[in-house]
């Protein structure tokens, strides 16, 4: 039962991580600039994301502009975009693999194969968690580097945006969720196939209960 609980918690955390990653990638709040113009006394915030940048006036009015040409974009931004999309797709792949191995599905009937699929999905989620970290940490590093660079003008300096914090949260959730799924399988693995039959008995329509198997097979 502990294994089942770990799996449920793992997949819930993973789903939350995926949603966070999606919002993080979509929001134009990776880099945030707060400044008061030298000549015009109008406070404004500039939000920069992977897909667009927005200018928010003190009046609350917001104007967003989608980046025109992909080729004209800086290489780090192109890489961050690519990693974001790849990560989101990898998580979806992981979810499909998990569903194939989940206790409540009949895609795969062999209990060992099912447990292996859950383990694979966990590994996929851990990898996606690491991939999520890359563009987020990369961007944060460039923001911090600019902040301490004396030749970068104040107007060009940025602050860490909400998307970066969401990205870190997403990465943490994916790593934790994936880790729990891996743990669920490894903890099950120590108890041998008997444990997996208990776990997966609901997914195999005509399987016998554990007590009906001769114990000599599990020595």
């Amino acid at each position: 039962m502990a294994s089942t609980g770990l799996q449920i918690l793992g997949i819930v955390l993973t789903l939350l991580g995926w949603v966070n990653a999606l919002v993080s990638c979509a929001l134009p709040m990776w880099k945030v600039t707060a400044f008061i113009g030298n000549s015009i006394v109008v406070a404004q915030m500039v939000w920069e994301g992977l897909w667009m940048s927005c200018v928010v006036q003190s009046t609350g009015q917001m104007q967003c502009k989608v980046y025109d040409s992909l080729l004209a974009l800086p290489q780090d931004l192109q890489a961050a975009r690519a990693l974001c999309v790849v990560t989101l797709l990898i998580v979806l792949l992981g979810l499909l693999v998990y569903l194939a191995g989940a206790k409540c599905t009949t895609c795969v009937e062999d209990r060992n194969s099912k447990s292996r699929l859950v383990l694979i999905s966990g590994i996929i989620f851990v990898i996606s968690g690491v991939l999520t970290l890359i563009p987020v940490c990369w961007t944060a590093h460039s923001i911090i580097q600019d902040f301490y660079n004396p030749l970068v003008a104040d107007a060009q300096k940025r602050e860490l945006g909400a998307s970066l914090y969401l990205g870190w949260a997403a990465s943490g959730l994916l790593l934790l969720g994936g880790g729990l799924l891996c743990c669920a399988c490894s903890s099950g693995g120590t108890q041998g196939p008997r444990h997996y039959m208990a776990c997966y008995s609901t997914s195999v329509p005509h399987s016998r209960g554990p007590s009906e198997y001769p114990t000599k097979n599990y020595v």
Partner: antibody, heavy 119, light 107 residues
């Protein structure tokens, strides 16, 4: 109008010392990063040192570290460069530079003061 | 240290022509590059920063571009007042270094 006037240059023997000054006017001195950049007789530009607006952070290349010291007096709107253990390769025109709020890099340059290190 | 290799060392062109000065960084500097113009007997002046952004008051015939670690300063429709030395400079990390300069003359 931004005005930067350097002074203190001259002829000095190798191993000697010299103190350059830069009088700033036309802007709020304590709001800007300041730097010194030199231009050798061969017309090469070399970054010498940078100091933060408050004076708390200084940045030097290895070539002058330990020999040159930058400082600023925000009350007097003056930037200083204390140069010691001077070498012949330090012979150059020294420019005082102000950073900018909008532009990266060395935005406003003074007219320069010539330092000649020779026997 | 990051080395900035600027070319050509000197350049002669006619009024109205388009000229391009290039600068290559020895390693990645992102877009942390500035271009300066120094007229005879004067102090250098900032023209371009962040590799492509023009300083206010600089004529639009000047433009900066980047391709990886190679940067270019292009002057369209060359004017007689553009006769000067041009320098590139990176500010990616300490120490900040300049290119060796390009002397631009009018034929």
């Amino acid at each position: 109008e931004v005005k930067l006037v350097e002074s203190g240059g001259g002829l000095v023997k190798p191993g000697g010392s010299l103190k350059l000054s830069c009088a700033a006017s036309g802007f709020t001195f304590n709001s800007y990063t300041m730097s010194w950049v030199r231009q050798t007789p061969a017309k090469r530009l070399e970054w010498v040192v940078t100091i933060s607006s408050g004076g708390g952070r200084t940045y030097y290349p290895d070539s002058v570290k330990g020999r040159f010291t930058i400082s600023r007096d925000n009350a007097r709107n003056t930037l200083y460069l204390q140069m010691s253990s001077l070498r012949s390769e330090d012979t150059a025109m020294y420019y005082c530079i102000r950073g900018d709020y909008r532009y990266d890099g060395f935005a406003y340059w003074g007219q320069g003061t010539l330092v000649t290190v020779s026997t | 240290d990051i080395q900035m290799t600027q070319s050509p060392a000197s350049l002669s062109a006619s009024v109205g022509e388009t000229v391009t000065i290039t600068c290559r960084a020895s390693e990645n500097i992102d877009s942390y590059l500035a271009w300066y113009q120094q007229k005879q007997g004067k102090s250098p002046q900032l023209l371009v920063y962040a590799s492509t952004l023009l300083v206010d008051g600089v004529p639009s015939r000047f433009s900066g571009s980047r391709s990886g670690t190679q940067f270019s300063l292009k002057i369209n429709s060359l004017q007689s007042e553009d006769v000067a030395r041009y320098y590139c400079q990176h500010y990616y990390s300490i120490p900040y270094t300049f290119g060796s300069g390009t002397k631009l003359e009018i034929k």
